[in-house]
């Protein structure tokens, strides 16, 4: 069913990183516009991105209300200039998205090494606790606030003068590692949610090396 000269949206895809969540679809509209609706499994439909010619819709504001809920979206197609027109079944053409559970599926964004500090033969490496768009009591929560101990970080580190990497793990945002005195080291971190089976890992952070601005060196 559907309206003459409109085509249903297809390839509905969730694109989500650190809970910033956008629904994308095809095709680019020709003489038609789209409206998106989103709901939880048990909730009411809420309309977003009314009569748009875009092929994406930012649904972050809706999904951050409860990131552990499972959401479904649908994209309605309307003829341009005649949005009241409906199909033979009495409603416009639409297509459903796959289900999406933000807590389980949002991609982990590339982490950033906030700082590192050497004290003798120990180095403390701190990972930036990135702010998300998830809110509680009118404040934005960090990635650690949202995921708690479900989120770990893996540190990769190596002597600047060699290629042999080592790793350490933490379920906080800090590492304390042993290093050889007088050697410079490079660091990269990766965020991981071990309990997931998909989207478990972020990409690696940019590499930071000792002897550059970000760190601090204290000889004890």
């Amino acid at each position: 069913s559907g309206t003459t000269n409109t085509v249903a949206a297809y390839n509905l895809t969730w694109k989500s990183t650190n809970f910033k969540t956008i629904l994308e679809w095809e095709p680019k509209p020709v003489n038609q516009v789209y409206t998106v609706q989103i709901s939880t499994k048990s909730g009411d439909w809420k309309s977003k991105c009314f009569y748009t010619t875009d092929t994406e819709c930012d649904l972050t504001d809706e999904i951050v209300k409860d990131v552990k809920q499972t959401y479904l979206a649908r994209v309605f197609s309307y003829p341009a200039g005649n949005v009241e027109s409906t199909g033979s079944a009495g409603e416009p053409l639409y297509e459903n998205s796959p289900e999406f559970t933000p807590y389980l599926e949002t991609n982990l964004g590339q982490p950033t090494i906030q700082s590192f500090e050497q004290v003798g033969t120990k180095v403390n490496v701190t990972v930036e606790d990135e702010r998300t768009l998830v809110r509680r009591n009118n404040t934005f929560l960090s990635l650690r606030d949202v995921f708690g101990k479900d989120l770990i970080y893996t540190l990769y580190y190596w002597k600047s003068s060699s290629s042999g990497k080592k790793t350490a793990k933490t379920n906080t945002n800090e590492f304390l590692i042993d290093v050889d005195k007088g050697e410079n080291y490079c660091f990269s971190v990766q965020a991981v949610i071990p309990s997931r089976t998909v989207n478990r890992k972020s990409t690696d952070s940019p590499v930071e090396c000792m002897g550059q601005e970000k760190g601090e060196f204290r000889e004890i």
């Epitope: 770990i152 080592k166 793990k169 379920n171 071990p194 997931r196 998909v198």
Partner: antibody, heavy 117, light 107 residues
Amino acid sequence: EVLLQQSGPELVKPGASVKIPCKASGYTFTEYNMDWVKQSHGKSLEWIGDINPNNGNTIYNQKFKGKATLTVDKSSTTAYLELRSLTSEDTAVYFCARDHDYYFDFWGQGTTLTVSS
Amino acid sequence: DIQMTQTPASQSASLGESVTITCLASQTIDTWLAWYQQKPGKSPQLLIYAATSLADGVPSRFSGSGSGTKFSFKISSLQAEDFVSYYCQQPYSSPYTFGGGTKLELK
């Protein structure tokens, strides 16, 4: 069902090389690192290293650097452990194991390598 | 490298008894510790992770405790199938080291 399938026993001569496969199935291969563990007869377990199948990045136990090389073939979801310049010290059972980050949750059945002339 | 010292290397016990195995890490590993069981000719099988968490499908007679550098593993009310080898492992810092193992023997 997660399965890590290793090849049968290998008998090789000193000085030779061997490449042991570990075929993974039942999960998304690129989501988990693959680790390799050595167990000499009647002895404990020794971690050789791990590989990230997504990008091929490897971490080695320094003890096995130059002895072991870890690779993957994403298209066949198979991890490989290559051991070179074999000596009798390399006679052992070699296990692949899926790395859950907090632990190794699934293990291959092990491949017995015997180095003998 | 972090050394994992596991004691005892072997222990004799009777059916229905309890046994405790200890693992000492040479430096703090928080709760990054796993315990595995290995039957003869088989691959290791996870029993405990994160020092105290029981893996899926593992009987409740197995338990783990500890944090930092000292960890314990307890089997209460030993069953016939428990008389095999046990290993601790730290997945905290590479190289991920194992304890020397404990072989449980039937008295």
